[in-house]
Every structure is written in C-alpha cells, then in structure tokens.
Interface confidence: medium
C-alpha cells in the first residue's frame, strides 16, 4: 500500500537490442513521478531517471559495465508535488522488474551484409561487424568483440532465377561459398547465438543480390 496519490508501476519490461537497454513500465503518470534504481544481485542500488514523468528509462550506461552480470531494477512512484512523501510502510511505493542478464538476453540487431566478392565459382560474403554501445578504452565494442565464438552467422543464398535457398554457417564474419558460374545470387544473413535459450536469432538482414553495387566480380 502507498499514499492515496500514487499507484505502483506495473508491467516492468526490459527492451534491449545490441545492449542498448531501456526499462519500460506502466501506467502513464497522473499526478505522480517515477525514479528508477538498478543493481546487480550483489551490488548497491544506483538511481537513474530522477522524478521523471516518462515511462521508460535508458539503463544502457549501467548494464554495459558488465554485460554478463544479472541486473534488477525497481521503479519508485512519488506524488508529483511531494516527492518526499512515502508509503504507509515509511518508504516510497515501488515495483521490481524481472531479472535481466544482457549477455544472455539482449536482442541481436538486424545484421548487414557489408560486401560480397566473386572470384570464379567462389563468392566471399562479409557481414558488417556491428558496433554495440559496450565501450572500453574509447572503443565501442563490436558484437564479435563481446560475444566471441558464441556468435555465429547463418547465410541464406539462392539463385536470382529460383527460390530454392541454401544455407551456410560461420563463426567469423565471412562466408566462402561455391556458386555456379554465370548465375546471379541473392544473399541474406542472420546472427545466431546457439547456446542461448531465448532471443537466439536476429531478424534477417536486408537481401543483397549480385549485379548490384555492393558486389565485386573478378574472373
């Protein structure tokens, strides 16, 4: 139970892609404001988004400090004009989020095919190593930096003239595939972390086809 003026936040939800991580909740405030706190299981609580009327809080700066930790957040509700006011138990009304482990749960963003190059009957397809918001030493780390060999890519490729798809996998950012000479092919890639139980796959990249700008052809 809280003060008569405030209601507890509910539907606390983590929204995270490539470690860009936002906590969302309801309801839209009416005569109340929110403050968010975040902590690891063994750490101290850190306050963020002080006395906000938003129903989301960007917690990226906190979770990127150690993406393998498990985090818990809580959202406090205060009367809009009296943030010192507390609930009947002598503390502000609050609600806990589900636990969130970025390394295991952040969504994999849509990958991009950086380039493809044909040499005879081989095509080398390169996936862009997308930068995340995880930062170390003035370096925005790439997905590969963070996930290492946990991250693989699946390539889907097919002749422009047909719909039958083939697949290839790599634990680097490059594929080398065999193609039929004189045929144009289209490509799409997907990022995958096979060891995960949730959010295992990204959405497919935009399709890129031979004969368009990104490719290069050499005899």
């Amino acid at each position: 139970s809280g003060t008569t003026n405030t209601v507890a936040a509910y539907n606390l939800t983590w929204k995270s892609t490539n470690f860009k991580t936002i906590l969302e909740w309801e309801p839209k405030p009416v005569n109340q404001v929110y403050t968010v706190q975040i902590s690891t299981k063994s750490g101290d609580w850190k306050s963020k988004c002080f006395y906000t009327t938003d129903t989301e809080c960007d917690l990226t700066d906190e979770i990127v400090k150690d993406v393998k930790q498990t985090y818990l957040a809580r959202v406090f509700s205060y009367p809009a004009g009296n943030v010192e006011s507390t609930g009947s138990a002598g503390e502000p009304l609050y609600e806990n989020s589900p636990e969130f482990t970025p390394y295991l749960e952040t969504n994999l963003g849509q990958p991009t095919i950086q380039s493809f190059e044909q040499v005879g009957t081989k095509v080398n397809v390169t996936v862009e190593d997308e930068r995340t918001l995880v930062r170390r030493n003035n370096t925005f780390l790439s997905l590969r930096d963070v996930f290492g060999k946990d991250l693989i890519y699946t390539l889907y490729y097919w002749k422009s003239s047909s719909s039958g798809k083939k697949t290839a996998k790599t634990n680097t950012n490059e594929f080398l595939i065999d193609v039929d000479k004189g045929e144009n092919y289209c490509f799409s890639v997907q990022a995958v972390i096979p060891s995960r139980t949730v959010n295992r796959k990204s959405t497919d990249s935009p399709v890129e086809c031979m004969g368009q700008e990104k490719g290069e052809f050499r005899e």
Partner: antibody
C-alpha cells in the same frame, strides 16, 4: 589452433631502431584487437600498446613510456602485427610479447612466446 | 596516465591459508580492474575481471573486491598450484599493470 609467433628481437644500441613482427594464425585476424606487452628482466608486466580491430578502424593506443617512439601496425593480408621501436633506451630492454586482446573484459587471451630486445652500448 | 600500486611485492604462505593482495589506483577507475595469474613459461591467465567477476573455469577460492581506487584480491584456501606471480590490471583508461606479487608456499 590460435598461434602467435614473435620475431625480430636482438641487440641494439641506445638511440637505435628495431622492428618486431608477430605472425598470427588460427583465427580471423581482422576481428581482433592486438597488443604488445613487455617484461624487463626481473620485473613485472608492462603494457606497451594496442591496435584495434576492423570495426574500430585499426586505431592505436600507447603507454606513456613509449608514446612518440613506438608505432604499432598490422598487415591484415599477412595476418601480421608489428612493433616499430625508434629512439630505443636501455630501459626498453625486455622480452616483448604479442597478445590477442579481448577488449570487453581486457583479457589477453592468447600470447606469443616472446622475443628478447636488448638495448645496450 | 593511471598508476597502479600493488602490494606486497612478495609473500609466503602455507597451504590452506588465506592470502590477500591489494592494488591502489592513482585515480578512480570505477570497477575496471582485473587480476591475472602468471606462471613461468606460460602466458598470464585472467582470473577475475570487473573487480569481482570470476572468469569461467576459475576456482571459487579466488575472489576480488573493491571499487574506485582500492581493490583486494584473495585466495581463501591456498593450494600448491597457486604458486605464481599475480598482477592487477586497470582498464578504465588504457591499460596499466600493477608491479606484481610473487606468491610462494612456505
């Protein structure tokens, strides 16, 4: 299997120059940050510098003790890392190691066997 | 540049004992501190990262704590295979190793 093999060490006079090489194999070289670490005789480890990966445009950083004198570069077509050392001082005498650097937790996860550089007149 | 002061430079302890090594940074480094174990003829091995997170496969007798400028590394039940030199490494701003602590068994 990941392998790093350094070469190019030797005896050089103070004020002289030397270029160390590190041949890498067993991993996609362009995806990794690479570093040089040294250990003077009877002393501890000292980080020398690193060169970032393709996603970070192969930019470099150096320890204050070598900045302006040492240059790290890489030839990705040869899977090779280099350390160009100029204006060498006696205090640069050390075994120089190349190491693969996983930046997210600052882990040097693979090391070469090292090459000895002796700066002496 | 950030300086790391590690102490003691050497220590001797008996099997089963608890040993502690400290590292002090010349400025606030948040919790961006690692502990490495270095055995002769081998590459240094990461034991603990981000002050207190145990690297996969590292025995739980190793632990770390601290934040800001003062950090502690503890081996709670010393084993013969723990003989090595231990280094702290800050990675908040570039990379700096501590001077190292040589751990010996009595």
């Amino acid at each position: 299997e990941v392998q790093l093999v350094e070469s190019g060490g030797g005896l050089v006079q103070p004020g002289g120059s030397l270029r160390l090489s590190c041949a890498a194999s067993g991993f996609t070289f362009t995806e990794y940050h690479m570093s040089w670490v040294r250990q003077a005789p009877g002393k501890g480890l000292e980080w020398v510098g690193f060169i970032r990966n393709r996603a970070n445009a192969y930019t470099t950083e150096y320890a204050a003790s070598v900045k302006g004198r040492f240059t790290i570069s890489r030839d990705n077509s040869k899977n090779s890392l280099y350390l160009q050392m100029n204006t060498l001082r006696t205090e640069d005498t050390a075994v120089y190691y190349c190491a693969r650097l996983t930046m997210v937790v600052a882990e040097f996860d693979y090391w070469g066997q090292g090459t000895l550089v002796t700066v002496s007149s | 540049a950030i300086q790391m002061t590690q102490s003691p430079s050497s220590l001797s302890a008996s099997v089963g004992e608890r040993v502690t090594i400290t590292c002090r940074a010349s400025q606030d480094i948040n919790k961006y501190l690692n502990w490495y174990q270095h055995k002769p003829g081998k590459g240094p091995k990461l034991l603990i990262y981000y002050t207190s997170t145990l690297q996969t496969g590292v025995p739980s007798r190793f632990s770390g704590s601290g934040s800001g400028t003062d950090f502690t590394f503890t081996v709670s039940n010393l084993q013969p295979e723990d003989i090595a030199t231990y280094y702290c490494l800050q990675y908040d701003n570039l990379l700096t190793f501590g001077q190292g602590t040589k751990l010996e068994i009595k």
